[in-house]
Amino acid sequence: AAIIPQSSACPNTEAKDFLQNVKVNLKVFNSLGAKVSSRRPSDYLNRSTSPWTLHRNEDPDRYPSVIWEAQCRHQRCVNAEGKLDHHMNSVLIQQEILVLKREPESCPFTFRVEKMLVGVGCTCVASIVRQAA
């Protein structure tokens, strides 16, 4: 691997305060290309046996400030007849993502990296039936 010489204008990555001085470019680049993103299905939320709705989660002190979150529509799953099946449960599938949270009262703005659990969809699982002793 080629070693890139460190410019004197760049912070020393070995310095203890390096992480306190990192600047992050918040521009989002679509490395997958337009064709991939245009094929994302948005109708699964209705067609699923465990349908969900999407809610616009807003937090002005977070980057990104808008995150769309899934919430299961029912506690149970929907069967082929469109009725709720009491032997099956709808459960939320969650994904852990990294977000930037703005430090309160910081000027200029500084951000800290935080983990966030986001609901991305729902799936259907068998109910746990507890046997009577």
Epitope: V28, N30, S37, S38, S42, R56, P60, W68
Partner: antibody, heavy 119, light 107 residues
Framework: EVQLVQSGAEVKKPGASVKVSCKAS????????FHWVRQAPGQGLEWIGV????????AYNQNFRDRATLTADKSTSTAYMELSSLRSEDTAVYYC????????????WGQGTLVTVSS | EIVMTQSPATLSVSPGERATLSCKAS??????VGWFQQKPGQSPRLLIY???NRYTGVPARFSGSGSGTDFTLTISSLQPEDFAVYFC?????????FGQGTKLEIK
């Protein structure tokens, strides 16, 4: 070039519904939110709601939650705003506008659709 | 909801002069404020986003400043095409709200 082209003017009677369309071109339709804003004659701008064509999610201004329905058709890259139970005070120009979710601002706007509600 | 109040309602300025438009939010909106220009029969046009960032293609005579609750749009040297209505808008939290507008007219 990004373009948002809206449907033509409509005249409706009180109690009726209207459906305004907004066809997008020049970018990937599913990548950005669509917001709808209206402007009554000589008045300011009022936010109606938002739809994300990529995931189908919607959010509404409480003032419109019961009457407005936002939808999107990915096959034609078109967003729709339907307003029901129209009254005279709904007479306004209705705009669709693209919102850059990550950057956080409205950049492109449709040309507007005048909806007149009159008996 | 957050109320955006613009002042003055009408501003009369001569071409070549400086115009200063004000916008106040009913609560802190950080820097999540945009400024739009609207001419009769036209759609709003984005000028400034995040309080002070000039949008692509907007002339350098337009500048924005402020944070929290007080925001200002300044047009350094008015050109004939600048006479229009200007709106401020917050996208800090929904429902997103707009000011009632300032009409900039030729003196």
């Amino acid at each position: 070039e990004v373009q948002l082209v809206q449907s033509g003017a409509e005249v409706k009677k009180p109690g009726a519904s209207v459906k305004v369309s907004c066809k997008a071109s020049g970018y990937t339709f599913t990548d950005y939110e669509f917001h709808w804003v209206r402007q009554a004659p000589g008045q300011g701008l009022e936010w109606i709601g938002v739809i994300h064509p990529g995931n189908g999610g919607t959010a509404y201004n409480q003032n419109f939650r019961d009457r407005a329905t936002l939808t999107a058709d990915k096959s034609t890259s078109t967003a729709y705003m339907e307003l029901s139970s129209l009254r005279s005070e709904d007479t306004a120009v209705y705009y669709c506008t693209r919102f850059l979710t990550y950057e956080g601002y409205f950049d492109y706007w449709g040309q507007g659709t005048l909806v007149t509600v009159s008996s | 909801e957050i109320v955006m109040t613009q002042s003055p309602a009408t501003l009369s300025v001569s071409p070549g002069e400086r115009a200063t438009l004000s916008c106040k939010a009913s609560q802190s909106v950080s820097i999540d404020v945009g400024w739009f220009q609207q001419k009769p029969g036209q759609s709003p046009r984005l000028l400034i986003y995040h309080a002070s960032n000039r949008y692509t293609g907007v002339p350098a005579r337009f500048s924005g400043s402020g944070s929290g609750t007080d925001f200002t749009l300044t047009i350094s040297s008015l050109q004939p095409e600048d006479f229009a209505v200007y709106f401020c808008q917050q996208d800090y939290s929904s429902p997103y709200t707009f000011g009632q507008g300032t009409k900039l007219e030729i003196k």
